[in-house]
Amino acid sequence: HTAAQDNCTCPTNKMTVCSPDGPGGRCQCRALGSGMAVDCSTLTSKCLLLKARMSAPKNARTLVRPSEHALVDNDGLYDPDCDPEGRFKARQCNQTSVCWCVNSVGVRRTDKGDLSLRCDELVRTHHILIDLRHRPTAGAFNHSDLDAELRRLFRERYRLHPKFVAAVHYEQPTIQIELRQNTSQKAAGDVDIGDAAYYFERDIKGESLFQGRGGLDLRVRGEPLQVERTLIYYLDEIPPKFSMKRLT
């Protein structure tokens, strides 16, 4: 695991504890909460990050209309179960034996049930729509400059392959970033769009997960891009299964 060897820290995840007793005497960083070793050369999975967060001391329209099947994360924080690779387990349960199925970004995609609830597979979120509203500026941003800056951000800061940033839409003051990544497209070593979106979301909220780096300073041609609200929609490869009661 490539953690900064000299002072044994994890550049990509501040919610870790690192010690020089990993394989071969190398620096090994463990995610708080789970204790799983993380690869500090890339983003940590959202599941391990959520688990760490829960364990932390209580210290003409060009815009996309989200599909009817798009999910928004309304349930907020919970302490998830992660599999040995750090991914969300398909079935999540709380302390009171209430269970539900989640997608690959950990968002609930079924009604809540009891321990008899079955979640046969972890359904992949293959399309993420990040909907941002920026604070008023002197004028609108140039669309192609904005597009280039956001693509650069996802490539350089989040190490997401450019092919997974499907589109950047802009209608002042609304910006939409579309991330797409099918199961078949994701190769070993590729950053998951769900993880990149989560890091971006935390950056936007001023809660950067990166070690010792300053917060996100987004600028388009020198002009600060300040976000005042964020909505993220998640589209799964298989539509979610909610009862009609929830939809009314």
Partner: antibody, heavy 115, light 107 residues
Framework: QVQLQQSGAELVRPGASVKLSCKAS????????INWVKQRPGQGLEWIGN????????NYNQKFKDRATLTVDKSSSTAFMQLSSPTSEDSAIYFC????????WGQGTTLTVSS | DIVLTQSPATLSVTPGDSVSLSCRAS??????LHWYQQKSHESPRLLIK???QSISGIPSRFSGSGSGTDFTLSINSVETEDFGMYFC?????????FGSGTKLEIK
């Protein structure tokens, strides 16, 4: 050389709290996890929990979470485990160990809980 | 919690024999498995770390292999000083867990 020196044997009454110590030397105390392990006579090994001295991050085996408290004193490079409300089931040898692969072990502290 | 199952529970051997001790994890733990030897009235001693990495001061007759869920500790030509208990331990995730042990005894 690396050493973990544990406190001496303890005889305590049921219900009376006890605090065991583990003094580390020969390495940078704040850089490695300290773990505590329980072994009842003729039995296997049971992980109680660990503490990372730099930041005092702790993790506990659920079985011990309510009664074991792990702390450190960085100035003396000493780790402590306090066990509250002990019963006869807590009579055992308690080891402190270093790291993730437990490369160094203390000599063990024998705790006897008896009235 | 990750469960480690060691087999056999007891192994009776003659000095000079070569033996293999097994440790199986209830889920994949990559190479985050360590082996210890414990003799009566002593602290355990680390023999092998991270499934196959040798430890300085440990005789070369001890070797480890495996990854994922199946691991083996091999002792090439057992010596009398090797008799005792052997435990495996996982450090893949908290809570860390130990196997129940294999007792290596003289036949």
């Amino acid at each position: 050389q690396v050493q973990l020196q544990q406190s001496g044997a303890e005889l305590v009454r049921p219900g009376a709290s006890v605090k065991l110590s583990c003094k580390a030397s020969g390495y940078t105390f704040t850089s490695y996890w300290i773990n505590w392990v329980k072994q009842r006579p003729g039995q296997g090994l049971e992980w109680i929990g660990n503490i990372f001295p730099s930041g005092s991050y702790t993790n506990y085996n659920q079985k011990f979470k309510d009664r074991a408290t792990l702390t450190v004193d960085k100035s003396s490079s000493t780790a402590f485990m306090q066990l509250s409300s002990p019963t006869s089931e807590d009579s055992a040898i308690y080891f402190c160990t270093r790291g993730s692969g437990f490369d160094y072990w203390g000599q063990g502290t024998t705790l006897t809980v008896s009235s | 919690d990750i469960v480690l199952t060691q087999s056999p529970a007891t192994l009776s051997v003659t000095p000079g024999d070569s033996v293999s001790l097994s440790c199986r994890a209830s889920q994949s733990i990559s190479n985050n498995l360590h082996w210890y030897q414990q003799k009566s009235h002593e602290s355990p001693r680390l023999l092998i770390k991270y499934a196959s990495q040798s430890i300085s001061g440990i005789p070369s007759r001890f070797s480890g292999s495996g990854s994922g869920t199946d691991f083996t500790l091999s002792i090439n030509s057992v010596e009398t000083e090797d008799f005792g208990m052997y435990f495996c331990q996982q450090s893949n995730s908290w809570p860390f867990t130990f196997g129940s042990g294999t007792k290596l005894e003289i036949k």
